[in-house]
Interface confidence: medium
Amino acid sequence: HNTTVFQGVAGQSLQVSCPYDSMKHWGRRKAWCRQLGEKGPCQRVVSTHNLWLLSFLRRWNGSTAITDDTLGGTLTITLRNLQPHDAGLYQCQSLHGSEADTLRKVLVEVLADPLDHRDAGDLWFPGESESFEDAHVEHSISRSLLEGEIPFPPTS
């Protein structure tokens, strides 16, 4: 799996999307986990509703929310009030029994303010390193609250 980079600004919300084959993963719950080091375990942060049919309901764990469009095949994770400590490597997972398939590897980058943001063309230098060849930057610098989303007060 190649790593997809999602960039957000400290204090704002970041939305991460993980597309998948809806037929292949039919009936499977999904999860968002944080990779502990480059070879360490992936620690579960939040998972979709215990009842797969209710996967569209947003579930929160602290400042992280998850919701799954099982028909369209898109898992969406929202990191609210993004902070420096949210930076790091994550995975979107599809669960089956005690096993988990990786849907997407995600690097969350937390920028100090919008002025620190640079265009993808400034970030990537194809051919410089193998790991950069298929790298992909998602621009999700900021957003408004989603319709129906509860505007939780910011936390430290």
């Epitope: 420096p84 400590h85 920028l111 100090a112 400034d122 970030l123 790298a135 430290s156």
Partner: antibody, heavy 118, light 107 residues
Framework: QVQLQESGPGLVKPSQTLSLTCTVS??????????WSWIRQHPGKGLEWIGY???????VYNPSLKSRVTISVDTSKNQFSLKLSSVTAADTAVYYC??????????WGQGTMVTVSS | DIQMTQSPSSVSASVGDRVTITCRAS??????LAWYQQKPGKAPKLLIY???SLQSGVPSRFSGSGSGTDFTLTISSLQPEDFATYYC?????????FGGGTKVEIK
């Protein structure tokens, strides 16, 4: 186990640019999961965060130094670098590079002393 | 910027003593705090992260506590190798900031 080693001139003249490189061994900068930082310590003083870089090349800097600092990464050499322009005697310090894991500075270089003097 | 204030700035103690160092943040930082030990001429070494989690390989005589704005590093029984300077660091908001340090000296 990852090791970091700072290198660069120990003496820089005022108004010039300080340039340091951190060479990483025992782990790949481009593997993701970490970000790479510079921190300095003025003689007999506390620690000051300069900034960090992700393997993708994007950076976050300390606002107090932002106008003068540039951190870059060279994944082919497994190195990241610091440039600090228009230095003065106040920039005399020990400069450390470090690997950051979930916001914690778990691996450090041994530090390199940089003196700004004419 | 979040200011991190350590106290005391220095403490004299004997081997076997219980030593407590405090760190106060100028605003709430939840549990996003670390403690480092630094010996002369050496780089800092991570002791405690997330306010109370002991870093691998660090002796259990070191412990951390606190949340919000007030944090404590405790050395339950001071050993000769513990004489050093200790720093706290917040990782809640940019810029990352460190405390001014507490020097633990031999009495």
């Amino acid at each position: 186990q990852v090791q970091l080693q700072e290198s660069g001139p120990g003496l820089v003249k005022p108004s010039q640019t300080l340039s340091l490189t951190c060479t990483v061994s025992g782990g790949s900068i481009s593997s993701g999961g970490y970000y790479w930082s510079w921190i300095r310590q003025h003689p007999g003083k506390g620690l000051e965060w300069i900034g960090y870089i992700y393997y993708s090349g994007s950076t976050v800097y300390n606002p107090s130094l932002k106008s003068r600092v540039t951190i870059s990464v060279d994944t082919s050499k497994n190195q990241f670098s610091l440039k600090l322009s228009s230095v003065t005697a106040a920039d005399t310090a020990v400069y450390y590079c470090a690997r950051v894991s979930s916001s914690w500075y778990k691996a450090w270089g041994q530090g390199t002393m940089v003196t700004v003097s004419s | 910027d979040i200011q991190m204030t350590q106290s005391p700035s220095s403490v004299s103690a004997s081997v076997g003593d219980r030593v407590t160092i405090t760190c106060r943040a100028s605003q709430g930082i939840s549990s996003w705090l670390a403690w480092y030990q630094q010996k002369p001429g050496k780089a800092p070494k991570l002791l405690i992260y997330a306010a109370s989690s002991l870093q691998s390989g660090v002796p259990s005589r070191f412990s951390g506590s606190g949340s919000g704005t007030d944090f404590t590093l405790t050395i339950s029984s001071l050993q000769p190798e513990d004489f050093a300077t200790y720093y706290c660091q917040q990782a809640s908001t940019f810029p990352i900031t460190f405390g001014g340090g507490t020097k633990v000296e031999i009495k």
